[in-house]
Amino acid sequence: KLTIESTPFNVAEGKEVLLLVHNLPQHLFGYSWYKGERVDGNRQIIGYVIGTQQATPGPAYSGREIIYPNASLLIQNIIQNDTGFYTLHVIKSDLVNEEATGQFRVYPELPKPSISSNNSKPVEDKDAVAFTCEPETQDATYLWWVNNQSLPVSPRLQLSNGNRTLTLFNVTRNDTASYKCETQNPVSARRSDSVILNVLYGPDAPTISPLNTSYRSGENLNLSCHAASNPPAQYSWFVNGTFQQSTQELFIPNITVNNSGSYTCQAHNSDTGLNRTTVTTITVYAEPPKPFITSNNSNPVEDEDAVALTCEPEIQNTTYLWWVNNQSLPVSPRLQLSNDNRTLTLLSVTRNDVGPYECGIQNELSVDHSDPVILNVLYGPDDPTISPSYTYYRPGVNLSLSCHAASNPPAQYSWLIDGNIQQHTQELFISNITEKNSGLYTCQANNSASGHSRTTVKTITVSAELPKPSISSNNSKPVEDKDAVAFTCEPEAQNTTYLWWVNGQSLPVSPRLQLSNGNRTLTLFNVTRNDARAYVCGIQNSVSANRSDPVTLDVLYGPDTPIISPPDSSYLSGANLNLSCHSASNPSPQYSWRINGIPQQHTQVLFIAKITPNNNGTYACFVSNLATGRNNSIVKSITVSA
């Protein structure tokens, strides 16, 4: 069926529209376009004869139309009047006619809107503000934005006049925001510039800071006043009711007891005409001088030097107090106080002794603290650590190694590869590594103050393929029901999967088995003798899969309660007594015997030939495992009948 599609359907004034013909019949004689929903010679726009390829304008032709051989009609420089229906009349070669009608709508391009306001400086909790979006345009939709968000739901916000007017009732300071309006029609959308609402408010009750109301003689008094206000408040200070100055801050140096009294701050807003005041009462006390600390060694060396800290000045009949890290002095053989507590000596300082240290002088009013003193303890360098801990890297990646050694002052670093100095930096970076970058990487840390140096060497292998792994253990002989064992699969490599097997089987589910560190570490908590099995780790990356040799866990256990055999307890006189003691234990236990409490021999077997009734009594076997530190025993009664 012949159809007309308008592209686009909604057309902006001045743009163009294409009336696109679908399913045009074969074997045509020609076609004509008409304005309107029917064929009307007075409203013909253009006709086209296929045989001559001749286009003939009609009465409704405006000079803006172009007809195409496929019957589509392009109308350029569209005007409002072009809105409506268009009919295509097709004459086939057999002179049978066909018609189809299409339509489009024309809309104006909207101008950029602007916002007008009925009140440029509304007062908080009093005024209302009405914003209107200009100009008024037919067939346009109006939208509003507050701080680039759509309007919040609020009973104080009201839209009217077809959403063209936004009214804010009873404005608050929180309404101070960026307001924009937007006009939309089917062919355009325009947004206004921002209008910032300037709400007048305050002053609120002023706050005086600091809150401190007690001061010592000789200190500076520096009070600051602040009240929320728009426009900003004007401030005035009164002391004991007498005006002092019109400033936000009040500064009185080197105060005395005479400066005690009531201090009032008054805040005034010239636009709202409102005043608010706040009063604080200041008390000034007479005080002794502030103490301070002197040191006999400002840069002590760790584990070598002692430091004596003295609290100054020396005042008779005064109690001296000391604090370290804001705590009272800890009990330590390395901390010594002089008889009058005025001197604190630190013997053989460590890096943890940096402080801060404070001393205090106690008087009837309070404790007067010195300023804190921090010790600059020189130490290190410790053995440097190279990170990350990977030892295997695949070719093509970047190698980025960082070295760190605890040191004061901070260490200076050097890197060597296979013994050759590379650079004097904390970090070593090599891009796009190859197998030729395999080698020994040494980080050297040097402390310029102590002159000490320490080095760490790391072997780095560059290979796409991983080596056969190995298992390291943190405990080669764990004790049953006491120790944990952590197995780690070496080496550590990037982009590598780690797997574990026990006795050739995948790991059993057990709360005592835990995988961590990306499955590289297998921890067995509270080992038992049943954990003495073969452990294997496997590693897998993009090109390799390898298993370690098995590691058998040697769990130390026992000794369990021993068993004495044979179980017989009655013997005939003249028989041989041959008792054997056995206890499950790893390693094998040491055995000893006691008869009626008297030690006999340190053997597993007790042999007595030709026993008599004199051999009646209690036979005790004692077992001892030196590795686990555990002991056990059992007692058996033997009766010999005549």
């Epitope: 796409a464 393929e465 995948s506 897998q540 899969a545």
Partner: antibody, heavy 120, light 106 residues
């Protein structure tokens, strides 16, 4: 049972491109790296590249950069090899293969191969 | 790229005979891997990480070597061993294969 099933033989025109598939069963391709290998008629084996289907990471032999593109779809457990601008040099059998731990043993599984013939 | 040179390119052996195929690398590699391929079939991993036999490989096969020189040995040749054997290195990218050794039965 672990299996790699490759798509059927392709006859393509010179200059065109082709996309070969390799569908895995018996394991999850996200857990392993998938490799592709080329074997020209009566010739040896050439490694093309691998892909980590979990994150799309790839490593290509320099010779095949720009020629081969590896992708994977975890939902269908399938890896793909896309070959572009084909010439007679690309006439070969293409294999996918994967190295995985099957229980305690490291196993290497190969697809049956896809034959690509390029006609002028 | 690391080049792998296999020798011989082609050889025949009688049943029971000892066979050694060598693979020489242009640079040192961590391990060498060996694949077996029979006509019309996919390659099979035969020996991995220089000396480990893949699952199902007869014990008459062995692998050895280090650095740049590696070999695959069959202690006693059998008819089913006739195939093409490829060595492969995975130490550095690109991964490379040897050109192959075609082993025939006499």
């Amino acid at each position: 049972e672990v299996q790699l099933q490759q798509s059927g033989a392709e006859l393509v025109r010179s200059g065109a491109s082709v996309k070969l598939s390799c569908t895995a069963s018996g394991f999850n391709i996200k857990d392993n790296y998938m490799h592709w290998v080329k074997q020209r008629p009566e010739q040896g084996l050439e490694w093309i590249a691998w892909i980590d289907p979990e994150n799309g990471d790839t490593e290509y032999a320099p010779k095949f950069r720009g020629k081969a593109t590896l992708t994977a779809d975890s939902s269908s457990n399938t890896a793909y090899l896309h070959l572009s601008s084909l010439t007679s040099e690309d006439t070969a059998v293409y294999y996918c293969h994967v190295l995985i731990y099957a229980g305690y043993l490291a196993m290497d599984y190969w697809g049956q191969g896809t034959s690509v013939a390029v006609s002028s | 790229d690391i080049e792998l040179t296999q020798s011989p390119a082609i050889m025949s052996a009688s049943p029971g005979e000892k066979v050694t195929i060598t693979c020489s690398a242009s640079s040192s590699v961590t391990y060498m891997h060996w694949f077996q391929q029979k006509p019309g079939t996919s390659p099979k991993l035969w020996i991995y990480s220089t000396s480990n036999l893949a699952s199902g490989v007869p014990a008459r096969f062995s692998g050895s070597g280090s650095g740049t020189s590696y070999s695959l040995t069959i202690s006693r040749m059998e008819a089913e061993d006739a195939a093409t054997y490829y060595c492969q290195q995975r130490s550095t990218y690109p991964l490379t294969f040897g050109a192959g050794t075609k082993l025939e039965i006499k």
